[in-house]
């Protein structure tokens, strides 16, 4: 049994880091493998993560963490029984993938304006809470070419757009994702999408 693709890990900078790797053949990850992780810090102890299968030869492990600070560094040991398959380290602050925003809502009752709001995925005491920026993706269910991205570079988790910038009388979907420049993070996963029917009063044409 050998590791074909070494573990790579990302942290949500809150309570979970996710490590993925591939074995050289079909593996029952949860029964055959264990990933031990230990904070490099005085009096810390090793903790065990039981991996799950992620495709035939792929494994994924969700490492629970109390919280994360920039100084944290972990040692990682991948074991198959008594055999050490791989040894490495992981600094969560250098491999951050933010949590996806939630509760995306489209408010259509504002006159001729669409107000999209969503929730910041972090509590106020988390460092990322005040450092997230967002990308909002809006697309038409009827027209695949009608696909647009709005970059939200301010902290407020909301976006206002004129309803008239979208076609009237058809359905649209929206989703939102986040990233944090301060830690040069990757983008989060997209939030679940929300759907609405876009309709607005056409301006009266004068001849």
């Amino acid at each position: 049994m050998k590791v074909l693709q070494e573990p790579t890990c990302v942290s949500d900078y809150m309570s979970i880091s996710t490590c993925e790797w591939k074995m050289n053949g079909p593996t029952n990850c949860s029964t055959e493998l264990r990933l031990l992780y230990q904070l490099v810090f005085l009096l810390s102890e090793a903790h065990t993560c039981i991996p799950e299968n992620n495709g035939g030869a792929g494994c994924v492990c969700h490492l629970l963490m109390d919280d994360v600070v920039s100084a944290d560094n972990y040692t990682l040991d991948l074991w198959a029984g008594q055999q050490l398959l791989w040894k490495g380290s992981f600094k969560p602050s250098e491999h951050v993938k933010p949590r996806a925003p939630g509760n995306l809502t489209v408010h259509t009752n504002v006159s001729d304006t669409l107000l999209l709001t969503w929730s910041n995925p972090y509590p106020p005491d988390n460092y990322l809470y005040n450092h997230l920026t967002y990308a909002v993706n809006i697309w038409s269910e009827n027209d695949p070419a009608d696909f647009r991205i709005y970059n939200v570079t301010y902290l407020e988790p909301s976006l206002r757009i004129a309803a008239s910038t979208l076609k009237s009388g058809i359905s649209y979907r929206a989703r939102v994702r986040a990233w944090a420049q301060c830690y040069n993070t990757t983008w989060s996963e997209w939030s679940p999408s929300t759907k609405w029917h876009n309709s607005y009063r056409e301006p009266f044409e004068q001849h």
Partner: antibody
Framework: EVQLVESGGGLEQPGGSLRLSCAGS????????MTWVRQAPGKGLEWVSS????????YYADSVKGRFTISRDNSKNTLYLQMNSLRAEDTAVYYC??????????????????WGQGTTVTVSS | DIVMTQSPLSLPVTPGEPASISCRSS???????????LDWYLQKSGQSPQLLIY???NRASGVPDRFSGSGSGTDFTLKISRVEAEDVGFYYC?????????FGQGTKLEIK
């Protein structure tokens, strides 16, 4: 009530051995690291050794490394300090203290928040 | 090893007056924001040490609010807003960031 009670001190000749014990009660003993601190007569406090909750990690002051061994029996809620090759400069009151919560991923630190009453070790010929 | 230096080493105080003890470390005790591994202990005559302040500024359970700790990095202070007769004894700062844990020399607080 959270409590630590030391025992095992006494008079010993240079080169001799003693085993100190520290019995814990009122808290989940195995969840916490434990620490030994000593105080020579008329002197300040000196850290001696620490051990993690499971006993897997141990740390020693250079002055006792290779001579003292810290250990614990979590089934008995007891901490030990085996002292070999004793020297006159080991003469001190030895305190055990409750250290950080090591069951957590990052050990939670609340200071050395509980101390025993101390046990006196005298090394003299 | 991290060297801890306390001052003053002797502190005569009139009851009801404030008192302040300084502690400096030879390297930063700041693991990260909110994690300065610096404690303050009081040892009264003939007794075991007792914890006053942990992580630089957190008052231990049962410690009167006249005791407060502050500082970060390498400079720390213990303040007693109004000294009482029962506060006499030796005050020690201690770093617990790395082993060996190291203590300051101790400050003897006495009543004038």
């Amino acid at each position: 009530e959270v409590q630590l009670v030391e025992s095992g001190g006494g008079l010993e000749q240079p080169g001799g051995s003693l085993r100190l014990s520290c019995a814990g009660s009122g808290f989940t003993f195995s969840d916490y690291a434990m620490t030994w601190v000593r105080q020579a007569p008329g002197k300040g406090l000196e850290w001696v050794s620490s051990i993690s909750g499971s006993g897997s990690n141990t740390y020693y002051a250079d002055s006792v490394k290779g001579r003292f061994t810290i250990s614990r029996d979590n089934s008995k809620n007891t901490l030990y300090l085996q002292m070999n090759s004793l020297r006159a400069e080991d003469t001190a009151v030895y305190y055990c203290a409750k250290d950080r919560l090591t069951i957590a991923i990052r050990p939670y630190y609340y200071g050395l928040d509980v101390w025993g009453q101390g046990t006196t070790v005298t090394v003299s010929s | 090893d991290i060297v801890m230096t306390q001052s003053p080493l002797s502190l005569p105080v009139t009851p009801g007056e404030p008192a302040s003890i300084s502690c400096r470390s030879s390297q930063s005790l700041d693991y990260s924001i909110g994690y300065n591994y610096l404690d303050w202990y009081l040892q009264k005559s003939g007794q075991s040490p007792q914890l006053l302040i942990y992580l630089a500024s957190n008052r231990a359970s049962g410690v009167p609010d006249r005791f407060s700790g502050s500082g970060s990095g390498t400079d720390f202070t213990l303040k007693i807003s109004r000294v009482e007769a029962e506060d006499v004894g030796f005050y020690y700062c201690m770093q617990a960031l790395q082993t060996p844990y190291t203590f300051g020399q101790g400050t003897k607080l006495e009543i004038k």
